[in-house]
């Protein structure tokens, strides 16, 4: 759970869920890009 | 219009686990904050843990730490809570409910778990 | 964790008349993004708990404008402008600031 990451405050981990989410779609946009390129 | 419904009124021996469901529909499930409370009866409310569907991450209630399973299957938008090691005093209410803005918008309709011998 | 108390624990106020519940934090619920996270909720004997207010004195839509909620740091107050009949029901405090997540032990609004 929560990846070894520790917050106190519930509104700081929503921002930490929202900056996986979005690293997550960059990183999954990347992923299709570089399989479509190949 | 967000709606959660849970499973039925369960019995269960000193002991055992039980497993309560809640469906969600009319929203994202997957990019929601599901929580799980408790009320015993006549009493307060007490909160148990969370889920992120999205990444199955979940944050739990020290008071439950180890006791507690919260999952969720996004192919159906069902959120589980599993309580392990019953006692007389997990006779409660459960419920599901959803946050939005940093509060929990909208609620189950409520499970009663007893715990009896 | 953080302590909710709040208080009373039970009210009888007359139809009409206004109804004052107060809740008190062991620590600030002002977060570092600048809300406070301190909710209110209402419920009815067999029902689920219903939100009315959340960031301390937003209502909820829908919720009439006789409820409301002031406070900051560690002190606030639900009030209820003019009590109605429907407005029978016990009230909760919880704070959604820290982990772990938690509740004041409820008031009990009745009719005098």
């Known amino acids: 759970h929560s990846d070894g990451i520790f917050t106190d405050s519930y509104s700081r981990y929503r921002k930490q869920m929202a900056v996986k989410k979005y690293l997550a779609a960059v990183l999954g946009k990347r992923y299709k890009q570089r399989v479509k390129n190949k | 219009e967000v709606q959660l419904v849970q499973s039925g009124a369960e019995v269960k021996k000193p002991g055992s686990s039980v497993k309560v469901s809640c469906k969600a529909s009319g929203g994202t499930f997957s990019d929601s904050y599901m929580h799980w409370v408790r009320q015993a009866p006549g009493q307060g409310l007490e909160w148990m843990g969370l889920i992120y569907p999205i990444f199955a991450d979940t944050r739990y209630a020290q008071k439950f730490q180890g006791r507690v399973t919260i999952t969720a299957d996004e192919s159906t938008s069902t959120a589980y809570m599993e309580l392990s090691s019953l006692r007389s005093e997990d006779t409660a209410v459960y419920y599901c409910a959803i946050d939005q803005d940093g509060s929990f918008a909208y609620w189950g309709q409520g499970t009663l778990v007893t715990v009896s011998s | 964790d953080i302590v909710m108390t709040q208080s009373p624990d039970s009210l009888a106020v007359s139809l009409g008349e206004r109804a004052t519940i107060n809740c008190k934090s062991s620590q600030s619920l002002l977060d570092a993004d600048g809300k406070t996270y301190l909710n209110w909720l209402q419920q009815k004997p067999g029902q689920p708990p219903k939100r009315l207010i959340y960031w301390a004195s937003t209502r909820e839509s829908g919720v009439p404008d006789r409820f409301s909620g002031s406070g900051s740091g560690t002190d606030f107050t639900l009030t209820i402008s003019s009590l109605q009949a429907e407005d029978v029901a016990v009230y909760y405090c919880?704070?959604?600031?820290?982990?772990?997540?938690?509740f004041g032990g409820g008031t009990k609004v009745e009719i005098k």
């Open positions: 919880w704070q959604g600031t820290w982990f772990d997540l938690t």
